[in-house]
């Protein structure tokens, strides 16, 4: 089957969530682990990751169309600490599939707000710190 | 268990220097951002430093810029404060704190290093 | 810069009573933190995100607010909730700052 990752982000006020979704089929989700790494061009790994989520099949899921599962990792209020670089994997221990996700970068500016670039789905995401707002 | 442990505090002359090691334990420590935060005697917490997870970005209060260097190794899961130019003012239990990735409240503090600053 | 101001500096309270601890602060932020300190001891986060518990705080604790103006409350005061707690909050430039902390005794 095909199995792809994309990476993406929303803000809710002052939060900004960093999402990765993993597409695949039913019968893939078992043994499956999703993952967001940061700074680590090399040793992305679950070990390595700031967080995980593992798969299980979801028996509720009828019929063997791609489904998707999501991993979200929410910044209640982005600092100069959480400047970098992003990415999202995921591997399977069973088929011994590994996938990687483009690299994002979030970028604090010195007048408080930030950026998210490099993703696929928006180029170019801009927030401001202090309002909330989406530009 | 995630433990933060500080050492190298003392009695230092005032314009001297002295380093303190936080050594961590229990966690990815090349994951998470890192500060330190002073207390002096029968006072209140005050922020002093901090450090990103990779090290290449640090952040002073204003009092302590140019006198103080915040630094680590993550291939020894340590972080340091070097204090220069000591002033009787830093006089302090200074801790070894880490940042919450996902908040910005400040999760994990080690039990302080005391640095006494006197002539 | 950002100032916090606790209120009261210091306070006692019996066994059982309610007890509330302000912090305000001098511009609107987005989330207070407490953390709580017992003498020679280290802080340790108490409320965090303005009302979320640490792990393994009571739930006798609760913390509310907004904007400039933020709370801890106790509901049932117990001997152990004798400590000092300080508010803190983190915005840019100035990145953390703390209030000067108040001191709760029991009676």
């Known amino acids: 089957g095909c199995i792809n990752i994309t990476s993406s982000a929303s803000q809710e006020g002052t939060r900004l969530n960093l999402i990765c979704t993993v597409w695949h089929k039913k019968e893939e989700a078992e043994g499956f682990v999703v993952f967001l790494c940061k700074d680590r061009s090399g040793d992305c790994s679950p070990e390595t990751s700031l967080k995980q989520l593992r798969l299980k099949r979801d028996p509720g899921i009828d019929g063997v169309g791609e489904i998707s599962s999501q991993l979200m990792f929410t910044i209640s209020q982005v600092t100069p600490l959480h400047s970098g670089t992003y990415q999202c994997c995921a591997r399977s221990q069973k088929s011994g599939i590994r996938l990687q996700g483009h690299f994002f970068s979030i970028l604090f500016t010195e007048t408080g707000n930030y950026t998210v670039t490099g993703l696929k789905q928006r180029q170019h995401l801009e927030f401001s710190h202090n309002e909330g707002t989406l530009s | 268990e995630v433990q933060l442990v500080e050492s190298g505090g003392g009695l230092v002359q005032p314009g001297r220097s002295l380093k303190l090691s936080c050594a961590a334990s229990?966690?990815?420590?090349?994951?998470?951002?890192m500060a330190w935060v002073r207390q002096a005697p029968t006072k209140g917490l005050e922020w002093v430093a901090s450090?990103?997870?990779?090290?290449?970005?640090?952040y002073y209060r204003d009092s302590v810029k140019g006198r103080f260097t915040i630094s680590r190794d993550n291939s020894k899961n340590t972080q340091y404060l070097q204090m220069d130019s000591l002033r009787s003012e830093d006089t302090a239990t200074y801790y070894c704190a880490t940042h919450n990735y996902e908040s910005t409240v400040l999760i994990t503090w080690g039990q302080g290093a005391s640095v006494t600053v006197s002539s | 810069e950002i100032v916090l101001t606790q209120s009261p500096t210091t306070t006692a309270a019996s066994p059982g009573e309610r007890v509330t601890i302000t912090c305000r602060a001098s511009s609107s932020v987005s989330y207070m933190h407490w953390y709580q300190q017992k003498p020679g001891a280290s802080p340790k986060p108490w409320i965090y995100e303005t009302s979320k518990l640490a792990s393994g705080v009571p739930d006798r604790f609760s913390g509310s607010g907004s904007g400039t103006s933020y709370s801890l409350t106790i509901n049932n005061m117990e001997a152990e909730d004798a400590a000092t707690y300080y508010c803190?909050?983190?915005?840019?430039?100035?990145?953390?700052?703390f209030g000067a902390g108040t001191k709760l005794e029991i009676k």
């Open positions: 229990g966690f990815t420590f090349s994951n998470y951002a």
């Open positions: 803190q909050q983190w915005n840019y430039p100035s990145m953390y700052t």
């Open positions: 450090i990103s997870s990779g090290g290449g970005d640090t």
